[in-house]
Structure formats: structure tokens, C-alpha cells
């Protein structure tokens, strides 16, 4: 699973101190380049639980692998669903945190419920502030079930979900009728795609037996370990205050992980850190209990003592989860929980064991996932342990999986499973990209998509002249930087190929496909100057220029005129394809615009020095903007616009144009003509319910005039302001908690 943790600080006396932090332990996390891993995203998810708009939340990045959300101003800002997205490509993973208001009418006994396919899930909402009205259960914002207030059992409303299936996963809420949705109890139900102890397509594979409350991932069979535990089977406890797949992260603050909720990739969900429990994770475990949410019991034997963070601490002479194993029994020592090798390599794997009698070379064996047993080729015997070395035959992809080191002596036996990941060296799927070229150099982007596995440790660029039999030149570059190939011949084609490598022995991949890159012809050196210009209309400009006289032929193919509209931040380029031309007519310009103008000579794809710039102001045209534009929602699909006619019109208006845009939407705006210019209101129909729109308009006489101010309005729907119930429609059946 992706090493991604979302921490919520639950010290809720002051919402302004509340924060959420997303931490990634992934290599190259959050670097932000598409090829090497997109950035971490941390946001409030308003699709199901909507809260009143407030000041925007502040996002702060701390290095490449951590992002924090702050700026909560009132308790209602905290209520709802937050998500963190991290990991690259197929490993892109979303971690979800659900926050309940401590002052809600109903509170969840347990927020996260992870169940297996076919199980019965029971969600329990505890009455905190009683109301004598119905309780409505919703699933992902849509109506799900109704309970009469008399149906409370021991002060709790229960929702039983028999025979759950993965599509039942999601956010559930229990709300008193006519109470604010912010007073709801919110739950998260995670349904694993397989029955208990199974994983994989068809659920045919057996889970490794996750310890300490770890949950077996239904897609890859890996254990998602609770915060504070590590190892293939979560068998190892981290030091107090540490978390992450390798215990590499540390809880902030002097009180360690107290008051923090940890959310991990599904199917784990959220819990307190190891050693803590309670709705705000501020209570230490009771004696005899340990682990995340204090869900585990120590049951230590043979004088072991219970540590609330790690479980049983065994006295000398004993080991095992409950100190139930005598040190006379052989024991595998310090076996890495996960090893990574490259395809077709022949690695050496070491396995160390101790015990009494002392293990010898023949008593230690290595078992592959297919059941093949390897015997050690040599052993190093030291006073406190024997280390057996195994020479592994050439690795194939099928060798990925759980391997096992087993030691057997007359004192007993021990075994340790560890995961072997066989990685495929990366092979570029595309040729490198030419960014810029000059007469004697090429600037190349080596970042290409690839098959096989990352991370990319080195990139080699191989190049030589086209059709040449000479040796390839090679340059080793940083994966994230562009490369400049220098000292090349002008107007020459070069064959360029990329080779990628990943860490470890045998990590070099095959060369990628070649591409032809041609160096440019010589740069033009002459600098033109602008002779003059004159305006031929509100959108037309005639420009003329000159070149210095030099001996010899003119090095150039034509001219490039550039017009820069600083107000709009737009550049217009006009190509004049004759090197003899000294004048050009520019049309289709924007009336009333201040342009900066220059001209350059070009040769092939190379540009010469630009002329000194000129500043040109085109005369304006079109009527002024309509005044006092106002929007008013009429229904869930209609919004009325009203306005006043523009002042000081140069002639009669022929029509108005209304621009409609979904607020925050990425799509193109819609333009609607109002063909009756005497009108000062119109109704925009066919809009989506509960959606915020932006409107602006302009008048047209011969040409289009200036835009009015922009106004915002939302279509009606199930909003927080609505006193009564939400509208019965498709949106009501699938309605949102507003």
C-alpha cells in the first residue's frame, strides 16, 4: 500500500488550532512533475457534507512529502469529510478523514467501520442531545433509512447493514429530522472486496495474517499496518511517537501522538495512534491493553509486562507476542520485512538465526512462493548467531510474493515471512522530446513515460549523427532536468535515445526508441527598426520597417511581427514570409487597446534580435457596459437577471449578450443572445440545481461593447438555509447534506 498518512489534530478547544497534515513516505512524493509523481493534495470534500462558506483554508507545504491545512475559524468549518491524495500513477491513493462535531445531537460510537464482503455492518449513533423526532440515515448524502425516536436502544440508534458489498462503502450519516446536518453523526464504511482473510481477483489468495490490528488489502494482499506498527505482517512495534510504514515519521509536539487521529489508505480507515483511545484520542490505554485505539490485549506470559505502545516486553530468556516462546527455541533474527530486486538478477539473501542448540548451515532453509526450497551455499557462524547465505537463481516476475526463512533444530523451529518485490527495469515508451535547437546545440527533455518500475535513479542520453557507424556519445543526467547536447554540427540530424535505470543491481533498462533531432541553421544577426505605422480602422494597423545594409546575401527567410497586449496578457504574432517585405497590414485587432509592437528577422526556426519596440493605441469602439447587473434564483433550474441600459449610447442597441459560467468550472462559458434590446431582465433556464453560476453581459451596436460587472448566484436546492425538507426530485432521493 502507499505510505500515506492523514493526521487530524483533535484538540478542539479552539478551532483555530485545529490542523490536518498529510504525510507521504513515498520516494519522490509531492515533487510535482507529472513524470516523477504528482503533488500531494489535501482538501475538504464538499460533495456530501456541505458547510456554510467561510474564509478559505490555508494550505502549507513542508518540503516535498508533507502538506498541512489550517485556517479553520469556527467549529462548523471542521465538520465533514477531508481527503488527502498521494502516490503516482496506478498507486495514486486517497485517504479520507471524517470529522464529527463534539457538540452534535448524535455522535458515532465508532467512526470508521472496516468489514469484509458479505459481513453485517452495524453503525451505532449515540444520543448526545435528545430530540423527539425521526432519525434519518443517509448514505453518501442520499436518503437511506428512517427510525422513529422510540427505536433508540440504550440511547443509541442502530443501522444494520446485512450482507454488505463493496458498493455499500461510503459516508453514512444519522440526523434528527429538522436538525442542522452539522449535528449529524458521520460514519465511514469500508467494505473490503473479499471475504475475511482473502485477497486478489476472485478472492482466491490467502492474506498473510496481519498482526496488531493490521488490515489485509483486498487488491495486493499487503497488510496496511496501524500507526505505530511496521513489517510485512505488522509484527514490529515502532518506538513511541513514531508512525509510517518504516516508523520514519514522528508525531509533532511534546505529548507525542496524544490527540491525533491517524487515517491510512483503505481498507484501514482511521484510528488513534498506538497507546491512545477515545473520541479525541486523548485517553491512554487501560492496563493490559495496547495498540491503536487500545484495541489489543497483551495477555503476557512468563513475567512479561504490558507496554501500551508495543505490547508485551519479555524478560530475558523469552520472546514471542505473549512471551510464550523460550529462547532455547531457535529464532530468526533481524529479517527485513521487505526486499526488492530487479528482474533477471541473481541476488544473495542472508538469513540469521540463534538458539540452543546452535543452528548450523543445514538447519536454515529458504522457501520461495512456489514452494521451491533453497539450501544455503555458505554460513557465517558467530558467537551469538548463524547467518546463512542463499544464492538465488535468476529472478522472474513470478518470484514476487512472500518468501519464508525457516530454521529447525532439536529445540524447535521458527520461521519468518518476508516480501520479495521483483521489479522490472524501466524502458522508455517514447523518444525524448526536443525543446529548443540552435546551430550547434540541442536542448532535450529526457522525461518520458516508461514501462516497468520506478523510481528512476539515472537517465542516460545516447546520441550520434544520423546514419553514422561511429560509437554513441553518452551523457548521464539528473532525472528531473533538461539536457543540453553541445558542440554539435550545424544543420545535422542526430539520432537520440534514452536509457533509464532504477536503483539496485541490474536496474538498467533497455534503450528506448530513437528520434531524429536536427540542429538549426545559422542565426540571423541583423536587427530591423520600425519606420512607422498608421491606424487604418479601429482594428487595423499598417506597419513598415527597415534593415541595415550589409554586404553579401541576406541571412533570413522572413519577418515576425509581435503585438503585445499588456492589459490582457496576450501576444499576437504575424508571420511575413518574404525577406524582401518591408510593410504589413495587421487586421482583427482589439479596438481601444494599447499594443507594444516589434519586428524580428527569422531564419529557419531561429529569430534574430528584435527591433526597438513601438507603442500603438487603437481607437475604441462598441457601447459602454450595461449597469447594475443583478441575479436572483427563482428555482432549482432558473435564475433571473436584471440590469439597466448603458449610459451615453452612440446609437440604438441591437442585442445583449449574456455569458454564463459554472463557478470554479473548467469548461467554456455559454453565450446567450437577448434579442429584444428594450428588455432589462431575462430568465436563464435549464440550469443545474444547487450550483453556483457566474454571469456578465454586454451590449452590441455595430460591434460588441464592454462587459458588465460579474455577478454570482446559486440555483435553489437542499441548502443550509432551507427551513424545511429538501426538494423531492432526483436531487432529493440523492440529495446532499447541506
Amino acid at each position: 500500500a502507499v505510505d500515506l498518512t492523514l493526521l487530524a489534530n483533535l484538540r478542539l478547544t479552539d478551532p483555530q488550532r485545529f490542523f490536518l497534515t498529510c504525510v507521504s513516505g513515498e520516494a519522490g512524493a509531492g515533487r510535482g512533475s507529472d513524470a516523477w509523481g504528482p503533488p500531494l493534495l489535501l482538501e475538504k470534500d464538499d460533495r456530501i457534507v456541505r458547510t456554510p462558506p467561510g474564509p478559505p483554508l490555508r494550505l502549507a507545504r513542508n518540503g516535498s512529502h508533507q502538506v498541512t491545512l489550517r485556517g479553520f475559524s469556527k467549529p462548523s468549518d471542521l465538520v465533514g469529510v477531508f481527503s488527502c491524495v498521494g502516490g503516482a500513477g496506478a498507486r495514486r491513493t486517497r485517504v479520507i478523514y471524517v470529522h464529527n462535531s463534539p457538540g452534535a445531537h448524535l455522535l458515532p460510537d465508532k467512526v470508521t467501520h472496516t468489514v469484509n464482503k458479505g459481513d453485517t455492518a452495524v453503525l451505532s449513533a449515540r444520543v448526545h442531545k435528545e430530540k423527539q423526532t425521526d432519525v434519518i440515515w443517509k448514505s453518501n448524502g442520499s436518503y437511506f433509512y428512517t427510525l422513529d425516536w422510540h427505536e433508540a436502544q440504550d440511547g443509541r440508534f442502530l443501522l444494520q447493514l446485512p450482507n454488505v458489498q463493496p458498493p455499500s462503502s461510503g459516508i453514512y450519516s444519522a440526523t434528527y429530522l429538522e436538525a442542522s446536518p452539522l449535528g449529524s453523526a458521520f460514519f465511514r464504511l469500508i467494505v473490503r472486496g473479499c471475504g475475511a482473510g482473502r485477497w486478489g481477483p476472485g478472492c482466491t489468495k490467502e492474506c498473510p495474517g496481519c498482526l496488531h490490528g493490521g488490515v489485509c488489502h483486498d487488491h495486493d494482499g499487503e497488510c496496511v499496518c496501524p500507526p505505530g506498527f511496521t513489517g510485512t505482517r505488522c509484527e514490529q512495534a515502532c518506538r513511541e511517537g513514531r508512525f509510517g510504514q518504516s516508523c520514519q515519521e514522528q508525531c509533532p509536539g511534546i505529548s507525542g501522538c496524544r490527540g491525533l487521529t491517524f487515517c491510512l489508505p483503505d481498507p484501514y480507515g482511521c484510528s488513534c495512534g498506538s497507546g491512545w483511545r477515545g473520541s479525541q484520542c486523548q485517553e491512554a490505554c487501560a492496563p493490559g491493553h495496547f495498540g491503536a485505539d487500545c484495541r489489543l490485549q497483551c495477555q503476557c506470559q512468563n513475567g512479561g509486562t504490558c507496554d501500551r505502545f508495543s505490547g508485551c516486553v519479555c524478560p530475558s530468556g523469552w520472546h514471542g507476542v505473549h512471551c510464550e516462546k523460550s529462547d532455547r527455541i531457535p529464532q530468526i533474527l533481524n529479517m527485513a520485512s521487505e526486499l526488492e530486486f530487479n528482474l533477471e538478477t541473481m541476488p544473495r539473501i542472508n538469513c540469521a538465526a540463534a538458539g540452543n542448540p546452535f543452528p548450523v548451515r543445514g538447519s536454515i532453509e529458504l522457501r520461495k512462493p512456489d514452494g521451491t526450497v533453497l539450501l544455503s551455499t555458505k554460513a557465517i557462524v558467530e558467537p551469538e548467531k548463524t547467518t546463512a547465505e542463499f544464492e538465488v537463481p535468476r529472478l522472474v516476475l513470478a518470484d514476487s510474493g512472500f518468501w519464508e526463512c525457516r530454521v529447525s533444530t532439536s529445540g524447535g523451529q521458527d520461521s519468518r515471512r518476508f516480501k520479495v518485490n521483483v521489479k522490472v527495469p524501466p524502458v522508455p515508451l517514447a523518444a525524448p522530446r526536443l525543446l529548443t535547437k540552435q546551430s550547434r546545440q540541442l536542448v532535450v527533455s529526457p522525461l518520458v513515460s516508461f514501462s516497468g518500475d520506478g523510481p528512476i535513479s539515472t537517465v542516460r542520453l545516447h546520441y550520434r549523427p544520423q546514419d553514422s557507424t561511429m560509437d554513441w556519445s553518452t551523457i548521464v543526467v539528473d532525472p528531473s532536468e533538461n539536457v543540453t547536447l553541445m558542440n554539435l554540427r550545424p544543420k545535422t540530424g542526430y539520432s537520440v535515445r534514452v536509457q533509464l535505470s532504477r536503483p539496485g543491481e541490474g536496474g538498467e533498462g533497455a534503450w528506448g526508441p530513437p528520434t531524429l533531432m536536427t540542429t538549426d541553421c545559422p542565426e540571423p544577426l541583423l536587427q530591423p527598426w520600425l519606420e512607422g505605422w498608421h491606424v487604418e480602422g479601429t482594428d487595423r494597423l499598417r506597419v513598415s520597417w527597415s534593415l541595415p545594409l550589409v554586404p553579401g546575401p541576406l541571412v533570413g527567410d522572413g519577418f515576425l511581427l509581435r503585438l503585445w497586449d499588456g492589459t490582457r496578457g496576450q501576444e499576437r504574432r504575424e508571420n511575413v514570409s518574404s525577406p524582401q517585405a518591408r510593410t504589413a497590414l495587421l487586421t482583427g485587432l482589439t479596438p481601444g487597446t494599447h499594443y507594444q509592437l516589434d519586428v524580428q528577422l527569422y531564419h529557419c526556426t531561429l529569430l534574430g534580435p528584435a527591433s526597438p519596440p513601438a507603442h500603438v493605441l487603437l481607437p475604441p469602439s462598441g457601447p459602454p457596459a450595461p449597469r447594475h447587473l443583478h441575479a436572483q434564483a427563482l428555482s432549482d433550474s432558473e435564475i433571473q437577471l436584471t440590469w439597466k441600459h448603458p449610459e451615453a449610447l452612440p446609437g440604438p442597441i441591437s442585442k445583449y449578450v449574456v455569458e454564463v459560467q459554472v463557478a470554479g468550472g473548467a469548461g467554456d462559458p455559454l453565450w446567450i443572445d437577448v434579442d429584444r434590446p428594450e428588455e432589462t431582465s431575462t430568465i436563464i433556464r435549464g440550469l443545474n440545481a444547487s450550483t453556483r453560476y457566474l454571469f456578465r453581459m454586454r451590449a452590441s451596436i455595430q460591434g460588441l461593447g464592454d462587459w458588465s460587472n460579474t455577478v454570482e448566484e446559486s440555483t435553489l436546492g437542499n441548502g443550509l438555509q432551507a427551513e424545511g425538507p429538501v426538494q423531492e426530485s432526483r436531487a432529493a432521493e440523492e440529495g446532499l447534506d447541506q
Epitope: 436518503y143 424545511g724 425538507p725 423531492e728 432529493a732
Partner: antibody, heavy 120, light 107 residues
Framework: EVQLLESGGGLVQPGGSLRLSCAAS????????MAWVRQAPGKGLEWVSS????????YYADSVKGRFTISRDNSKNTLYLQMNSLRAEDTAVYYC?????????????WGQGTLVTVSS | DIQMTQSPATLSVSPGERATLSCRAS??????LAWYQHKPGQAPRLLIY???IRATGIPARFSGSGSGTEFTLTISSLQSEDFGVYYC?????????FGQGTKVEIK
């Protein structure tokens, strides 16, 4: 499409019994509150009884309390009304109805009704 | 029990005219009120709930207003298909209660 189909109506003598059924389809029956509403000849609508999704909570109009029993079988998607000690004033068209999804917001879906006549 | 009183008992309106129906509750029902249209031989049809929210598929000429004890159903421009009996119903409390109905006739 939500469909509600009542059956079991007919002629019965005063003091007799009758059991009405309502077969539901087009929605997840086990998740919605259901009700019976009636209309006597020449009179207005009168709410009779409602039952919650679990079947554990029921409500009745004073005029039928102690004589009528509402029940449901979620496995069969069926609503029932057991009517005992029938009186002439119970003569009416009986409608099976399903509430809106937001539970308390009126009765959104109705059957076509079944006629119950109590007469000697 | 909460009593619901509708007025007038009968309303004769010409097509295209506005029709206004009233409903009064004996105690406050907040906005927990629905309006239904009932035609002979048909099932009742939910028009308005939450005192002012149009149900799915109900034309915009039907609108509801009011809260507490006084409620109004307005048909802005009566169509020939709008005849029938109109009922208000409170769902604030058990037992649910209907008004006695207002019959809308086409003049």
C-alpha cells in the same frame, strides 16, 4: 418507477374482518415508511396508519386504534392492514402510500386504491 | 390532535385566472405542510411539501407559501386540467391530519 398495488378489498358485514395487502416495486421497500390513507364516499382524505421501515414502530388514527393493525414483510415487499370489528363508517377507498425519501415530507407515491364496503 | 381547516369549500375560477386556497392549522406546524390534488377515480397527487417546495414534475404555476398556522396554495393561471379537490395535510405530529378539502371548479 415506484408502483403500489392494493388488493384484498370487498364487501364485509359489520363486526367482520378483512386484510388488505399492498405489493410494492420500483424502490427499496425495506428502507421507507409506509402508510394507509382512506376516503369515505363523498368525504375527504383521512390518514389511517403509518409504519416505520423496521416494522417496530406504528401509529394509528384514533378512529381505528385497537381495531386495525398495520404490518409489513420486507422480504416480500408487502404492506398489510388487518381490519377487525369493522363498522359501516369504515366503508372507504383505502390507499397504500409511500412517504418522500426525506421521511417526514408528505406522501409522495400512492396506489390506485381498493374499495372496502361494510354493510349488512 | 392538530385540526386543519381549509377555505373556501368551493372555488369557481375561469381558465387563465389566479386561484388562491387557504389552510389554517389549530397550532403551529412550522413548515411541515403538504398540498395534494385529488381527482375522481385517481390516486391523490403530491403538489407541494415543506409548505413551499414543489414536488417533482409539478408545473411552476403551483406555488405554496406560509409557515406556522397560516398557509396558501396559489395557482397563478388556472388550466382546465387543474380542476379537482385540493387537500392540505400537516406532518408535524401524529396523528397526521388532512383539511376537509377545497373543490376547484372551472367557471
Amino acid at each position: 418507477e415506484v408502483q403500489l398495488l392494493e388488493s384484498g378489498g370487498g364487501l364485509v358485514q359489520p363486526g367482520g374482518s378483512l386484510r388488505l395487502s399492498c405489493a410494492a416495486s420500483g424502490f427499496t421497500f425495506s428502507r421507507y415508511r409506509m402508510a394507509w390513507v382512506r376516503q369515505a364516499p363523498g368525504k375527504g382524505l383521512e390518514w389511517v396508519s403509518s409504519i416505520y421501515p423496521s416494522g417496530g414502530v406504528t401509529y394509528y388514527a384514533d378512529s381505528v386504534k385497537g381495531r386495525f393493525t398495520i404490518s409489513r414483510d420486507n422480504s416480500k415487499n408487502t404492506l398489510y392492514l388487518q381490519m377487525n370489528s369493522l363498522r359501516a363508517e369504515d366503508t372507504a377507498v383505502y390507499y397504500c402510500a409511500r412517504d418522500l425519501s426525506i421521511a417526514a415530507a408528505g406522501t409522495a407515491y400512492w396506489g390506485q386504491g381498493t374499495l372496502v364496503t361494510v354493510s349488512s | 390532535d392538530i385540526q386543519m381547516t381549509q377555505s373556501p369549500a368551493t372555488l369557481s375560477v375561469s381558465p387563465g385566472e389566479r386561484a388562491t386556497l387557504s389552510c389554517r392549522a389549530s397550532q403551529s406546524v412550522s413548515s411541515n405542510l403538504a398540498w395534494y390534488q385529488h381527482k375522481p377515480g385517481q390516486a391523490p397527487r403530491l403538489l407541494i411539501y415543506g409548505a413551499s417546495i414543489r414536488a417533482t414534475g409539478i408545473p411552476a404555476r403551483f406555488s405554496g407559501s406560509g409557515s406556522g398556522t397560516e398557509f396558501t396554495l396559489t395557482i397563478s393561471s388556472l388550466q382546465s386540467e387543474d380542476f379537482g379537490v385540493y387537500y392540505c395535510q400537516q406532518y408535524k405530529d401524529w396523528p397526521r391530519t388532512f383539511g376537509q378539502g377545497t373543490k376547484v371548479e372551472i367557471k
